[in-house]
């Protein structure tokens, strides 16, 4: 025998209280697949979350973050504060990148400058808090009299920024 509930399309639920009739999902709820015995409560985008896509009878609401924040986690489960380039977020708030590290985005962590010498190259442009170093030709490739910038290597225990 076929389960009568399997005929209930998305946007409805199989109502046990009404002889398993397919009833529309109540307001602020949805069912994204057929054959559901209940509808799921719509996600509400409150506070630092804002609505990117409204809830419908067949799909949940989708949230993103208000300006100054960015999404984290699957389906934007968290909003995290933006920082400026050259900073990273810590418990204390936005903090400048430590010497030898950079962040060219408003989110994420400070990363070390590229170690140019790994590829046998030299530093053409020094790194900053906001930008990675630019590697240039290897010192041997430089013409006589030319020189490259050689900043202190970040391969040490960093101090506080």
């Amino acid at each position: 025998l076929q389960d009568p509930c399997s005929n209930c399309p998305a946007g409805t639920f199989c109502d046990n209280n009404r002889n398993q009739i397919c009833s529309p999902c109540p307001p602020n709820s949805f069912s994204s697949a057929g054959g559901q015995r209940t509808c799921d409560i719509c996600r509400q985008c409150k506070g630092v979350f804002r609505t990117r896509k409204e809830c419908s009878s067949t799909s949940n609401a989708e949230c993103d973050c208000t300006p100054g924040f960015h999404c984290l986690g699957a389906g934007c489960s968290m909003c995290e504060q933006d920082c400026k380039q050259g900073q990273e977020l810590t418990k204390k708030g936005c903090k400048d990148c430590c010497f030898g590290t950079f962040n060219d985005q408003k989110r994420g962590i400070c990363r070390p400058w590229t170690n140019c010498s790994l590829d046998g190259k030299s530093v053409l442009v020094n790194g900053t808090k906001e930008r990675d170093v630019v590697c240039g030709p290897s010192p041997a490739d430089l013409s006589p009299g030319a020189s490259s910038v050689t900043p202190p290597a970040p391969a040490r225990e960093p101090g506080h920024s």
């Epitope: 984290l72 995290e80 990273e88 977020l89 810590t90 418990k91 204390k92 903090k95 430590c98 030898g100 590290t101 994420g108 962590i109 400070c110 990363r111 070390p112 400058w113 590229t114 170690n115 790994l118 990675d132 970040p154 391969a155 225990e157 960093p158 101090g159 506080h160 920024s161």
Partner: antibody, heavy 121, light 111 residues
């Protein structure tokens, strides 16, 4: 599923060197710090240093500067720890661990199983 | 530089509550995230609490984290302790945002 699998441990003569591997899978290897931490028998956790595999940038604990070298092969999704001039007190389980990229003072969300290095003649 | 101090051992009877302390030697505990790891013999550490009070998926609700500014300490609390909770527990924070600092570890014994 994120995994860190270590290898390369074993018995090493005093004055010798070791090269440990940390093979990563299940995530974008170039986008997370790999930290190296060791634990001597019956002792606590000790930071050796860390590498950003995306560009080879490294940091070393003061105690290990000049003796430890980190590298990464992005084609193999593997990080390496090379340590020279080993002494008996370097006997420990060596771990690699991944740090998430959310904030600058975050936890280690995945650890390798550890590999035991014994320095003895 | 930042140091974290833990008691070497804590003993508790099954079903009781264990509280492990992690004291920050300088600065304000409210400015530092503290993370907690459990380590059983022969195994790698496992995150029990991260960012002061958050529990990773799969960690029982019996484990909770908190901090107290007056004692400048973070706490790992295990309610309704079970035999399987017997392990070493380490707190973890940062000196700079690159340099991790670990407490010396606390051996939890279930009597």
């Amino acid at each position: 599923e994120v995994q860190l699998v270590e290898s390369g441990g074993g018995l090493v003569q005093p004055g010798g060197s070791l090269r440990l591997s940390c093979a990563a899978s299940g995530y974008t290897f170039t986008s997370y710090y790999i930290y190296w931490v060791r634990q001597a028998p019956g002792k606590g956790l000790e930071w050796i240093g860390n590498i950003w595999p995306g560009n080879g940038g490294t940091f070393y604990g003061e105690k290990f500067m000049g003796r430890a070298t980190f590298s990464a092969d992005t084609s193999k999704n593997t990080a390496y720890l090379q340590m020279n001039s080993l002494r008996a007190e370097d006997t420990a389980v060596y771990y690699c661990a991944r740090r998430p990229d959310y904030s600058g003072d975050d936890y280690f969300d995945y650890w390798g199983q550890g590999t035991l290095v014994t320095v003895s003649s | 530089s930042v140091e974290l101090t833990q008691p070497p051992s804590v003993s508790v009877s099954p079903g009781q509550t264990a509280r492990i302390t992690c004291k920050l030697n300088s600065g304000n505990i409210g400015s530092y995230y503290v993370h907690w790891y459990q380590q059983k013999p022969g195994q790698a550490p496992v995150t029990m609490i991260y960012r002061d009070d958050k529990r990773p998926d799969g960690i029982p609700e019996r484990f909770s984290g908190s901090s107290d500014s007056s004692s400048n300490s973070a706490f790992l609390t295990i309610s309704g302790v079970q035999a399987e909770d017997e392990a070493d527990y380490y707190c973890h924070s940062y000196d700079s945002t690159i340099t991790p600092v670990f407490g010396g570890g606390t051996k939890l014994t279930v009597l």
